[in-house]
């Protein structure tokens, strides 16, 4: 039969080469002379020439040693042809399996592995994993099966076997009690990887195990008592730096201090943060202190670490006496923003309100007042009493200065301290509407045909507020009612102007008197352009020219 079983060839064969492997034979050779050839990677394609075939005998030849780690299997095709070159058999698959030799040592993936573990952990705790690879086969043989071991440990304190390693996975674990960072901060392990599952070639690497600090020392205040002076009202002011000492590893969570105000800060006036480098507690003011309310604060501050203590440790407490220093404080308007209702258009000299400030200082300081910002110049303020009066006409409808019926004024109070301090207040005048505007029609110019004219609808606007607005009433004056009619609609917010008699093309004044709900009357002249046309028109047509 024209078949060949898979051929196994050990790698690294010593020859001699060419080495006969197997004979290809076609039973057609009884009828005709057969010539044999092989194709495929390893024969006629890269890597060429590894295998050959004796053309006339069919012997498959190996020309050089094989390397399983380079190519583990070759797939070739055998061919049989007659003397005239005609194929006498289908191409035959030839599988050549390269069997492994233990020709590679294990290799650690790193020369030095680094891991860490907390001091004082329970035996059994995992530290790190080391890895070695072996290019040899680990599936069908033990050539590439690596076993790990610890060859030595430095230092050998408190025992020479502080760690163990998982034979197969390379996981290093703590095996003994007594890891103490303060005594041994780092261990150097010489680790071995041995192939043949521990019975073959060995390679070594180093595993450095850093012993991390556990929080077994409490931070201690040094000193424990402090006195500080702080000006009143200062926010974010550094009051005091508190110093602690901690025997744990510097800059570790077991060393870094966490400060807590335990008592004496009833008003939540203080905050304490940790300086990232010095580890000091920086006590600052969160809110301004008030000398007049309390001129001395006694704070109690406790210190712990970022990391929890691993055993019961006494916490250290510091006492800080904070003396508050008096400063000249600015007068404060009461309230800071005052809303006052006042009628628009009140007479000049009429009082609007009294707006005064209080001085937080206990000394009887004199306060003087003045207006800081009065955009329309409508007001004046008495410097001694804080009395605000009208000096101009307050106009609610003045869109330049009044927003949503409110006129905003800023006032200033100044004490006579040395140096003097000032405080500001905001006066919000809510202007009460007065019926001081009559209704106005829009538009005030109309164009209308003198034949079958269309009614002109004019909108009525009134700057005042209800009830000083609609419903409106309309009346034509100065004989305008001879040619025109004016009627207010049912809603009372538009007026309809109609041409009731023929007028020749020209421009006319229509005298329209509108009055609001409060009978405030406003006379408006409507400019009406009458055109020679029918129905609706926007501009008068030009004169007709005959041809």
């Amino acid at each position: 039969d024209w078949v060949v079983a898979p051929i196994s060839v050990p790698e690294n064969g010593k020859g001699p080469f060419p080495q006969r492997l197997n004979q290809l034979k076609s039973n057609k050779d009884r009828d005709t002379k057969i010539f044999y050839s092989i194709t495929g990677p390893g024969a006629d394609s890269p890597p060429e020439g590894v295998f050959a075939v004796e053309k006339e005998t069919g012997w498959l030849l190996l020309n050089k040693p094989l390397d399983r780690e380079e190519i583990a299997k070759y797939e070739l095709f055998g061919h049989a042809v007659s003397e005239n070159g005609a194929s006498v058999e289908d191409p035959m698959n030839i599988s050549i399996i390269v069997t492994d030799q233990n020709d590679h040592k294990p290799k650690f993936t790193q020369d030095t592995f680094r891991g860490s573990v907390l001091e004082g952990v329970l035996p059994g705790t995992s530290v790190m994993q080391v890895t070695a690879t072996d290019e040899d086969d680990a599936i069908y043989t033990y050539n590439g099966v690596v076993a790990y071991s610890i060859h030595s440990q430095e230092p050998k304190d408190p025992h020479d076997l502080m760690f163990t390693i998982h034979r197969s996975t390379g996981t290093i674990s703590v095996i003994s009690s007594g890891l103490d960072r303060e005594k041994v901060p780092e261990y150097t392990l010489t680790i071995q990887a041995t192939d043949m599952d521990g019975d073959g070639s060995t390679t070594t690497a180093v595993a450095v195990v850093e012993i991390l600090d556990a929080n077994d020392n409490a931070p201690m205040f040094d000193p424990q008592k402090y006195e500080a002076h702080v000006p009143e009202n200062a926010v974010g002011h550094e009051v005091q730096r508190l110093t602690v000492t901690d025997l744990d590893a510097p800059n570790s969570p077991a060393w870094r201090a966490t400060y807590l105000i335990m008592g004496g800060d009833d008003g939540d006036h203080f905050t304490i943060t940790t300086h990232p480098e010095s580890n000091q507690g920086i006590l600052t003011t969160r809110k301004g202190l008030d000398f007049e309310a309390k001129n001395q604060h006694t704070l109690y501050v406790e210190v712990t670490n970022e990391a929890p203590f691993v055993l019961k440790l006494p916490t250290s407490t510091a006492t800080i006496v904070v003396h508050v220093e008096d400063v000249n404080e600015a007068p404060v308007f009461v309230p800071p923003s005052k809303v006052v209702e006042v009628q628009e258009g009140i007479p000049t000299g009429e009082p609007v309100c009294v707006y005064t400030a209080e001085d937080p200082d206990k000394e009887n300081q004199k306060i003087s007042y003045r207006i800081l910002r009065d955009p329309a110049g409508w007001l004046a303020m008495d410097p001694d009493s804080g009395q605000v009066t009208a000096v101009g006409t307050l106009d609610r409808e003045d869109e330049q200065f009044v927003r949503n019926n409110i006129y905003e004024v800023m006032v200033l109070a100044m004490d006579n301290g040395s140096p003097p301090t000032t405080g500001t207040g905001t006066l919000l005048l809510t202007l009460i509407d007065v019926n001081d505007h009559g209704p106005v029609p829009e538009p005030r110019q109309i164009t209308i045909c003198n034949q079958s004219p269309v009614r002109q609808v004019l909108n009525i606007t009134d700057k005042d507020l209800s009830p000083h607005t609609s419903p409106f009433q309309a009346q034509l004056t100065d004989d305008s009612d001879i040619y025109w009619t004016a009627e207010v609609n049912e809603e009372g917010d538009t007026v309809v102007l109609s041409l009731k008699k023929f007028l020749k093309q020209d421009t006319y004044d229509v005298h329209l008197s509108l009055s609001d709900h409060g009978n405030k009357e406003q006379l408006t002249v409507i400019r009406a352009t009458v055109c020679d046309c029918h129905g609706h028109v926007e501009t008068c047509p030009g004169p007709w020219k005959g041809g």
């Epitope: 907390l118 001091e119 004082g120 952990v121 329970l122 035996p123 059994g124 705790t125 995992s126 408190p158 163990t164 998982h166 034979r167 197969s168 996975t169 996981t171 674990s173 703590v174 095996i175 003994s176 009690s177 007594g178 556990a214 929080n215 077994d216 691993v310 055993l311």
Partner: antibody, heavy 117, light 111 residues
Framework: EVQLLESGGGLVQPGGSLRLSCAAS????????MSWVRQAPGKGLEWVSA????????YYADSVKGRFTISRDNSKNTLYLQMNSLRAEDTAVYYC??????????WGQGTMVTVSS | QSALTQPASVSGSPGQSITISCTGT?????????VSWYQQHPGKAPKLILS???KRPSGVSNRFSGSKSGNTASLSISGLQAEDEADYYC???????????FGGGTKLTVL
């Protein structure tokens, strides 16, 4: 002489509590991890809990997690096991032992805990 | 169901030798040389007789020896004596919690 001496066992109703103590002598107690191992009547050994030398690291078997608390007072050379919400299946002799990592040695003489109504 | 498998009982006559096996996995017995053996007489506390597969603590008779092959450890007692009659427990370190596994125990009877 290295010695471990347990106490605190007794009869308790289901749902009740007990506190076991183990007094150590003859070795530097704070340098060694300690553990509690129990043995139900006629049964094998079961590791219950362990604590590191400083007390900062603890281990509990799933069967007691959330109910038992291991602690130690190195100033008194004493190991404790606080047992709450006790069940009938917690009935056993409780031994304290030094956990060296690869083995348990020495062992105390044991204290009997019986959970029964 | 114990994590490590031991025969429930073995027996032997005085002067004979016996072996107790302890089978685990490649993650415990097979992975570490930290197999220990404990002897427990009725009503008494366990006592360490072998650590690290075959190391005897001081005071333990050299008739006790240990070995390990693959995932199975063995305790051998030569020259059996009446006082050897007891329960024997194996234990192995493992890198996963719980870090110590116990066998179910083997009752040794000296005939």
């Amino acid at each position: 002489e290295v010695q471990l001496l347990e106490s605190g066992g007794g009869l308790v109703q289901p749902g009740g509590s007990l506190r076991l103590s183990c007094a150590a002598s003859g070795f530097t107690f704070s340098s060694y991890a300690m553990s509690w191992v129990r043995q139900a009547p006629g049964k094998g050994l079961e590791w219950v809990s362990a604590i590191s030398g400083s007390g900062g690291s603890t281990y509990y078997a799933d069967s007691v997690k959330g109910r038992f608390t291991i602690s130690r007072d190195n100033s008194k050379n004493t190991l404790y096991l606080q047992m709450n919400s006790l069940r009938a299946e917690d009935t056993a002799v409780y031994y304290c032992a030094s956990w060296g990592g690869g083995w348990f040695d020495p062992w105390g003489q044991g204290t009997m805990v019986t959970v029964s109504s | 169901q114990s994590a490590l498998t031991q025969p429930a009982s073995v027996s032997g006559s005085p002067g004979q030798s016996i072996t107790i096996s302890c089978t685990g996995t490649s993650n415990d017995v097979g992975a570490y040389n930290y197999v220990s053996w404990y002897q427990q007489h009725p009503g008494k506390a366990p006592k360490l007789i072998l650590s690290e597969v075959n190391k005897r603590p001081s005071g333990v008779s050299n008739r006790f020896s240990g070995s390990k092959s693959g995932n199975t450890a063995s305790l051998s007692i030569s020259g059996l004596q009446a006082e050897d009659e007891a329960d024997y427990y194996c234990s192995s370190f493992t890198s996963q919690i719980p870090w110590a596994l116990f066998g179910g125990g083997t009752k040794l009877t000296v005939l």
